[in-house]
């Protein structure tokens, strides 16, 4: 299936903001009537964009984190790369998004 960039919005009850992903989603609001008409979605591409957007949002909210007294609130950080430290909330969002993509792919209609 041809890959194109789309805006994917999680359901209202999901704990992540609108993020970009590669892949075509005919239905982008979670499970509802007709939402099995999906084409391939990519976890790897999505993770890349999720990280970009969430880190971007994080910088907007806390541009001067180095000045915060609680900057070291999370002492153990998991590195996706040598440059990008991920705090637990971000790891949680990534896991949730992986779950969403697996669920969406499991809900795909088989096209003959």
């Amino acid at each position: 299936a041809p890959m194109k960039e789309a805006n994917v919005h999680g359901q209202g009850n999901l704990a992540y903001p609108a993020v970009r992903t590669h892949g075509t989603l005919e239905s982008v609001n979670g499970p509802r009537a007709g939402s099995r008409g999906l084409t391939t979605t990519s976890l790897a591409d999505t993770f890349e964009h999720v990280i970009e957007e969430l880190l971007d949002e994080d910088q907007k909210v806390r541009p001067n984190e180095e000045n915060h007294k609680d900057a070291d609130l999370y002492t153990s950080r998991v590195m996706l790369s040598s440059q990008v430290p991920l705090e637990p909330p971000l790891l949680f969002l990534l896991e949730e998004y992986k779950n969403y993509l697996d669920a969406a792919n499991m809900s795909m209609r088989v096209r003959r």
Epitope: G30, P31, A33, T40, S42, L101, D102, N105
Partner: antibody, heavy 115, light 107 residues
Framework: EVKVVESGGGLVQPGGSLRLSCATS????????MSWVRQPPGKALEWLGF??????????EYSSSVKGRFTISRDNSQSILYLQMNTLRAEDSATYYC??????WGQGTSVTVSS | DIQMTQSPASLSASVGETVTITCRAS??????LAWYQKKQGKSPHLLVY???TLADGVPSRFSGSASGTQYSLKIDSLQPEDFGSYYC?????????FGSGTKLEIK
Amino acid sequence: EVKVVESGGGLVQPGGSLRLSCATSGFTFTDYYMSWVRQPPGKALEWLGFIRNKANGYTTEYSSSVKGRFTISRDNSQSILYLQMNTLRAEDSATYYCAITMDYWGQGTSVTVSS
Amino acid sequence: DIQMTQSPASLSASVGETVTITCRASGNIHNYLAWYQKKQGKSPHLLVYNAQTLADGVPSRFSGSASGTQYSLKIDSLQPEDFGSYYCQHFWSTPFTFGSGTKLEIK
């Protein structure tokens, strides 16, 4: 027409190995997640695991009951899904089903683990 | 892991009656739930997906609903071919566990 046909079941001794196959046709195999599910005699359905599609790197997930013993793989050139089962136990006796997403299921193949 | 608690385990009903089967998820599965019909010696047959969407070719007497973490399958005006076992399965975070099943028998 979408077709899903499992094969490879049979009688095997405890501790032995068996490889199940699931031959498919009628759809673009690489676009879809493929799953294995089993049902022991008189018991409920049990999800064993899946292998993701091409876009998601053909990565796998397993249930804790088979992780480390069972391996799901796929031959994308022939549109075949496999389930390699090692260190088989009596409790692995069941009918094994292969499924395309949740949509199409094969007729199942029976596995009996007994000495 | 998310557990699916299905009830009742068995159910006896007559042709023409309405029955409801429920599954409760131990966590939020965001409506990613399917219902299957399973007959002896046959493969599972998808009835409902995403909690309330009817699969292709499934009669309209079947319907799915959701309320919080509780999911229901209702069968109106039971037909002879509806008897068999029914299972729910969630698709939110692996493992994608099934409910324990409901055996629907003819009264």
